[in-house]
């Protein structure tokens, strides 16, 4: 069963998942001037058993101008997008995927991938919203939306978030007991296809809304 819509749009906000439920698909998209290799995967799929989940398939891109280039494996940590704001002493190595049964972590970037990610979510997936830089949340803390099924139909719950243009506070404000408001809980675990974008967020992030897709350039 497909989700009828994308996650709700909130003006001046972006959304992201903490982790991805099994069954989630990520399109293998390449940046301009590149294309998927012939016989390459169309998508990555989060699969697993009761104790271990991981992304099946590898996304591989090759230059549109060359025919025989098939190099493109997931980049090594030192080649991956730098996590500039964390001042890590060494590259952060993800822990074993088994630590999140039923879920996959954010897939690492692949060489020449597109600047936006298109995910196909399953029912029960939760995404979290935050105001973009330059806007503050009237409802403090991360708001969430859940893809849920009710009476045989899928829908996304409405996140409780309003972003207002106040430059002096962060997009994730709040010293005094901020909150996040869940609305509703998923009632079944059938599939829900949703096209959306994913982001590699930096604190100094900028986001623009184009039709129903949020686009953020990788930093």
């Amino acid at each position: 069963e497909l989700c009828d819509d994308d996650p709700p749009e909130i003006p001046h906000a972006t959304f992201k998942a903490m982790a991805y439920k099994e069954g989630t698909m990520l399109n293998c998209e390449c940046k301009r001037g590149f294309r998927r290799i012939k016989s390459g995967s169309l998508y990555m799929l989060c699969t697993g058993n009761s104790s271990h989940s991981s992304w099946d398939n590898q996304c591989q891109c090759t230059s549109s101008a060359t025919r025989n280039t098939t190099k493109q494996v997931t980049p090594q940590p030192e080649e991956q997008k730098e996590r500039k704001t964390t001042e890590m002493q060494s590259p952060m190595q993800p822990v074993d995927q088994a630590s999140l049964p039923g879920h996959c972590r954010e897939p690492p970037p692949w060489e020449n991938e597109a600047t936006e990610r298109i995910y196909h979510f399953v029912v029960g997936q939760m995404v979290y919203y935050q105001c973009v830089q330059g806007y503050r949340a009237l409802h403090r803390g991360p708001a969430e939306s859940v893809c849920k099924m009710t009476h045989g139909k899928t829908r996304w719950t409405q996140p409780q978030l309003i972003c207002t243009g106040e430059m002096e506070t962060s997009q994730f404000p709040g010293e005094e007991k901020p909150q996040a408001s869940p609305e509703g809980r998923p009632e079944s675990e059938t599939s829900c296809l949703v096209t959306t974008t994913d982001f590699q967020i930096q604190t100094e992030m900028a986001a623009t809304m184009e039709t129903s897709i949020f686009t953020t350039e990788y930093q």
């Epitope: 704001t85 994730f172 590699q200």
Partner: nanobody, 121 residues
Framework: QVQLVESGGGLVQPGGSLRLSCAAS????????VSWARLTPGKRLEWVSA???????YYADSMQGRFTISRDNAKNTVYLQMNSLKPEDTAVYYC???????????????WGQGTQVTVSS
């Protein structure tokens, strides 16, 4: 290599309390936000709480007023004090670090192995 080690879970009766700890290493702890999330028996992954590098705290509604997050930068440890526990709080609780180190929920990529909390009479 980043390491996150949770402890403090266990079996507790409804209305009881637990204090979870997350000991971190392998990165500059004081400049990073830390989140707690939980995986319910139905395999639902829920964000619980977060604390930013400046000490700002964030809570999900259902935990508001019952849970308190804090950090001790000298010990590279984050704590989650859980009071008035309910059966629906039963879950594996995970300590997590966002990939850019600052935004408490977005882009979490680094997880501990989790600690089981069971609330039952």
């Amino acid at each position: 290599q980043v390491q996150l080690v949770e402890s403090g879970g266990g079996l507790v009766q409804p209305g009881g309390s637990l204090r979870l700890s997350c000991a971190a290493s392998g990165f500059t702890f004081s400049s990073s936000a830390v989140s707690w999330a939980r995986l319910t028996p139905g395999k639902r992954l829920e964000w619980v709480s977060a604390i930013a590098s400046d000490g700002s705290t964030y809570y999900a509604d259902s935990m508001q007023g019952r849970f308190t997050i804090s950090r001790d930068n000298a010990k590279n440890t984050v704590y989650l004090q859980m009071n008035s526990l309910k059966p629906e709080d039963t879950a594996v609780y995970y300590c997590a670090i966002p990939r850019d180190g600052l935004v408490p929920v977005f882009g979490i990529d680094y997880w501990g192995q989790g600690t089981q909390v069971t609330v039952s009479s």
